[in-house]
């Protein structure tokens, strides 16, 4: 992999997903992403964020919930829920604007 650009202070986060290279990762912030794909049980992934902080501000839907935090291992014990019902104005993958 190419050397990645420095982004200033990094935080250590819990990493739990199929793509984690170890139990922790380092990033600009920590993340928890809860995703429910069609016909499957929701899956919760923990990791690091470096790009597109705007996703942290997205409203939970019945398909996805993003959570972000900024301190050491702050994503370790966070548990997320999905919205129970989808309102007419919301769609899967709701735009984060």
């Amino acid at each position: 992999d190419p050397v990645k650009p420095s982004r200033g202070p990094l935080v250590t986060c819990t990493c739990e997903s199929p793509h984690c290279r170890g139990p922790t990762c380092q990033g600009a912030w920590c993340t928890v992403v809860l995703v429910r794909e069609e016909g499957r049980h929701p899956q919760e992934h923990r990791g690091c964020g470096n790009l597109h902080r705007e996703l942290c501000r997205g409203r939970p839907t019945e398909f996805v919930n993003h959570y972000c935090c900024d301190s050491h291992l702050c994503n370790r014990n966070v548990s997320l829920v999905l919205e129970a019902t989808q309102t007419p104005s919301e769609q899967p993958g709701t735009d984060s604007q």
């Epitope: 990645k4 650009p5 790009l51 902080r53 996703l55 993003h66 993958g93």
Partner: antibody
Framework: QVQLQESGPGLVKPSQTLSLTCTVS??????????WNWIRQHPGKGLEWIGY???????YYNPSLKSRVTISVDTSKNQFSLKLSSVTAADTAVYYC??????????WGQGTLVTVSS | EIVLTQSPGTLSLSPGERATLSCRAS???????LAWYQQKPGQAPRLLIY???SRATGIPDRFSGSGSGTDSTLTISRLEPEDFAVYYC?????????FGQGTRLEIK
């Protein structure tokens, strides 16, 4: 080595919906490290960012196109797709897909020309 | 949205010369998320520089990037015939992502 390949109709009629798919090979679209983008380039002009999707299905669109754009992901097929509704001749362009991480947009698909004409 | 303005619009130089391309942002851009791309006719853009100054894999060391805040520069120290193309700067990492309008580097 990750490769991206755009596919879809090269000709779309005005007022219809443009639909393109980007197939990712050599890597997983489900990795949390990447964002999957669509970009277009009008003939002889510069690059215009359309929007991105994350593996979770969360999206962000260019405000100038937001009302007409939908980007979706199919992790089981390792694909993501673009739909642009109510097209006009001004939507004639080469459409590219690209992977984004903290090292920029790399790789890109080779691009596909979509012409809007009756 | 951050507007990126590239200058000059066209740059006419000879092989062996040094090229300096500028990209100015309408507001401060994190240097971690500033990239440069090269595009040749009929081809997709190719990543040259990311993080304002890091060369992408396989990019010759005659290409270098510098700058911070609102001003970024792409320098090609000694032009080769294959370097004549259009160059775009881009800010990414936060949305909406934007590109500069491009600088055309042509043979004098």
């Amino acid at each position: 080595q990750v490769q991206l390949q755009e596919s879809g109709p090269g000709l779309v009629k005005p007022s219809q919906t443009l639909s393109l798919t980007c197939t990712v090979s050599g890597g997983s679209i489900s990795s949390g490290d990447y964002y999957w983008n669509w970009i277009r380039q009008h003939p002889g002009k510069g690059l215009e960012w359309i929007g991105y999707i994350y593996y979770s299905g969360s999206t962000y669109y260019n405000p100038s196109l937001k009302s007409r754009v939908t980007i979706s992901v199919d992790t089981s097929k390792n694909q993501f797709s673009l739909k642009l509704s109510s097209v006009t001749a001004a939507d004639t362009a080469v459409y590219y897909c690209a992977r984004e991480d903290i090292a920029g947009f790399d790789p890109w698909g080779q691009g596909t020309l979509v012409t809007v004409s009756s | 949205e951050i507007v990126l303005t590239q200058s000059p619009g066209t740059l006419s130089l000879s092989p062996g010369e040094r090229a300096t391309l500028s990209c100015r942002a309408s507001q401060s851009v994190s240097s971690s998320y500033l990239a440069w791309y090269q595009q040749k006719p009929g081809q997709a853009p190719r990543l040259l520089i990311y993080g304002a100054s890091s060369r992408a894999t396989g990019i010759p060391d005659r290409f270098s990037g510098s700058g911070s805040g609102t001003d970024s520069t792409l320098t090609i120290s000694r032009l080769e015939p294959e370097d004549f193309a259009v160059y775009y700067c881009q800010q990414y990492g936060s949305s909406p992502i934007t590109f500069g309008q491009g600088t055309r580097l042509e043979i004098k």
